[in-house]
């Protein structure tokens, strides 16, 4: 572990500061981590990391002159599970062929860059659950259809918050098993079109806080368990509750919206077919009793990723066999915002 210009320890290489003007061609191919921090790299050239068969992590951070990432930079790296590209405000272009064949990828971060389009992830083909973390890229305005096809054969978490997203096309999430979608803090985002989740499974968690979204799509929310819409002042109405059959937790803007969940009963037709099997009824009742108050989904500040992808909700949820739905909703109605004002006693009864 020795290099003329990069620091290293135990096969981790740190290429740091202004003396680093290009990716050194003589970095040992058995490196397990590469970090490029505060450098003067302008271009990351095609094939810069080819042959790094043991490479697990790449970090490219605080590189203020970086402009371009060429094709085949992150390609054919069998052990690579983490890529971080952050604080590169002059990074305007990532070649569509930059990310290819990364079977172990679990985390891809692109934040605080100048890119205008989402990176092309169609050829990543990860065999792992992937967290795609694309934040603080104020020049990304659109999410095109099929934007995440080919990212992973497993489920994905998409953190797309704090970008400049203004428009999301129908079928944007086609082909994904969407565990979590975070669109918060895209202040100019006004619409989630009706078919935005067409071809997708999920989302299970959806965060649209601090956007201008005025309505949720009519389709694709069947698996939604947790909805966050804090400070989403344009969201004046929710879909009919029949569209939110799995919802268990809602964190909303207006207390009045929580009134909708008071004494909500699922129609028998909405229950999962397994619930009708009489052999299972006793077991289901016992299990739901024993579990009592279910463990809450990921805390607001804790991602499913940080808990090691402990996605318990992918198993069958016997609570869905309860007719009475206990949705945890906030902000709760109170003396100043009583449900009676908007719903009336008759409906509540």
């Amino acid at each position: 572990c020795h290099h003329r210009i990069c620091h290293c320890s135990n096969r981790v290489f740190l290429c740091q500061e202004s003396k680093v003007t290009e990716i050194p061609s003589d970095l040992p191919r058995n490196a397990i981590e590469l970090r490029f921090v505060l450098t003067k790299l302008r271009v990351i050239q095609k094939g810069a990391f080819s042959g790094f068969g043991d490479l697990e992590k790449i970090e490219i951070s605080q590189n203020d002159v970086l402009e371009v990432i060429e094709a085949d930079v992150f390609s054919n790296l069998p052990k690579l599970h983490e890529i971080r590209i952050e604080k590169a405000n002059n990074l305007l272009y990532i070649n569509p062929e930059a990310f290819q064949n990364l079977p172990n990828l679990q985390y891809l971060l692109i934040s605080n860059t100048g890119i205008k389009h989402l990176p092309d992830v169609h050829k990543i083909h990860s065999l792992q659950k992937v967290l795609l973390d694309i934040q603080d890229n104020i020049n990304i305005h659109t999410i095109e259809r099929n934007s995440f096809v080919g990212l992973s054969f497993e489920s994905v978490i998409l953190w797309l918050n704090k970008n400049g997203i203004q428009e999301i096309h129908n079928c944007a999430f086609n082909g994904t098993q969407l565990d979590e979608l975070n669109l918060s803090d895209n202040n100019n985002l006004e619409e989630l079109p009706n078919d935005v989740f067409h071809g997708a499974s999920g989302p299970v968690i959806l965060d649209i806080s601090r956007t201008r979204i005025h309505s949720l799509p009519s389709y694709g929310l069947e698996n939604l368990k947790k909805l966050r819409a804090r400070s989403t002042y344009n969201l004046k109405k929710l879909p009919t509750l029949e569209k939110l059959v799995a919802l268990m937790e809602a964190s909303l803007t207006y207390p009045s919206h929580c009134c909708a969940f008071a004494n909500w009963r699922r129609q028998i037709s909405e229950l999962h077919p397994i619930c009708n099997k009489s052999i299972l009824r006793q077991e289901v009742d016992y299990m739901t009793q024993a579990r009592g108050q279910r463990s809450s989904l990921a805390e607001d500040n804790e991602s499913s990723y940080s808990r090691g992808f402990d996605m318990t909700y992918t198993e069958f949820d016997y609570d869905l066999c309860n007719e009475v739905v206990d949705v945890t909703c906030s902000p709760k109605p109170d003396a100043f915002n009583p449900c009676e004002d908007i719903m009336g006693y008759n409906i509540l009864r």
Partner: antibody
Framework: QVNLKESGPGILQPSQTLNLTCSFS??????????VGWIRQPSGKGLDWLAH???????RYNPALKSRLTISKDASSNQVFLKIASVVTADTATYYC????????????WGHGTTLTVSS | DIVLTQSPASLAVSLGQRATISCRAS??????????LNWFQQKPGQPPKLLIY???NQRSGVPARFSGSGSGTDFSLNIHPMEEDDTAMYFC?????????FGGGTKVEIK
């Protein structure tokens, strides 16, 4: 085979200027990643880093002595120079020239040192 | 400045036994996952010689009985098994930030 050799006056009077020369072989200060520095050690005491210079002429000084230090190089003749102005008795020490690798800032090879005595 | 404090100041170890020297930094010497902490050996009348760099990486040609460990602010140098030739002064040194500084040294002798 890397070799470094220090040369200096041996004895100086207080307030005089110390001029040290490091002559080296086995590497070039024109090669990226290479640096040469100076470290001193008073007899029977610890080590003090003074200054170093990189291949690209980037220089770093110990802030406690910066106002008195000047480091320079002549890459073509494989030499590095250190000037210490206004010496005092506390500058009495063995002065080592060191080859530094930018990777890990490693003090890879040391000269045998030259002794300076400051006495009136 | 980052102050490095070595302990003990001196140490007597039997041949074949383990010598452990500690080096504590006044603040972390880690940067982006790498510890900028080196260990040197100095014998009387000779310049120091690099043994360990980046806390735990052995310089080529250094015997395997020398090993380093630690991160952040706490580091140690181990010599095992102790040999006659290992009688010397040992210094830790940080190069995380200028001014690069050295510990006060530990004198290791044979008991």
């Amino acid at each position: 085979q890397v070799n470094l050799k220090e040369s200096g006056p041996g004895i100086l009077q207080p307030s005089q200027t110390l001029n040290l020369t490091c002559s080296f072989s086995g590497f070039s200060l024109s090669t990226s990643g290479m640096g040469v520095g100076w470290i001193r050690q008073p007899s029977g005491k610890g080590l003090d880093w003074l200054a170093h210079i990189w291949w690209d002429d980037d220089k770093r000084y110990n802030p406690a002595l910066k106002s008195r230090l000047t480091i320079s190089k002549d890459a073509s003749s494989n030499q590095v120079f250190l000037k210490i102005a206004s010496v005092v008795t506390a500058d009495t020490a063995t002065y080592y020239c060191v080859q530094i690798n930018y990777g890990n800032y490693r003090f890879d090879n040391w000269g045998h040192g030259t002794t300076l005595t400051v006495s009136s | 400045d980052i102050v490095l404090t070595q302990s003990p100041a001196s140490l007597a170890v039997s041949l074949g036994q383990r010598a452990t020297i500690s080096c504590r930094a006044s603040e972390s010497v880690d940067n982006y996952g790498i510890s900028f902490l080196n260990w040197f050996q100095q014998k009387p009348g000779q310049p120091p010689k690099l043994l360990i760099y980046a806390a735990s990486n052995q310089r080529s040609g250094v015997p395997a009985r020398f090993s380093g460990s630690g991160s952040g602010t706490d580091f140690s140098l181990n010599i095992h098994p102790m040999e006659e030739d290992d009688t010397a002064m040992y210094f830790c040194q940080q190069s995380k930030e200028v001014p690069w500084t050295f510990g006060g040294g530990t004198k290791v002798e044979i008991k």
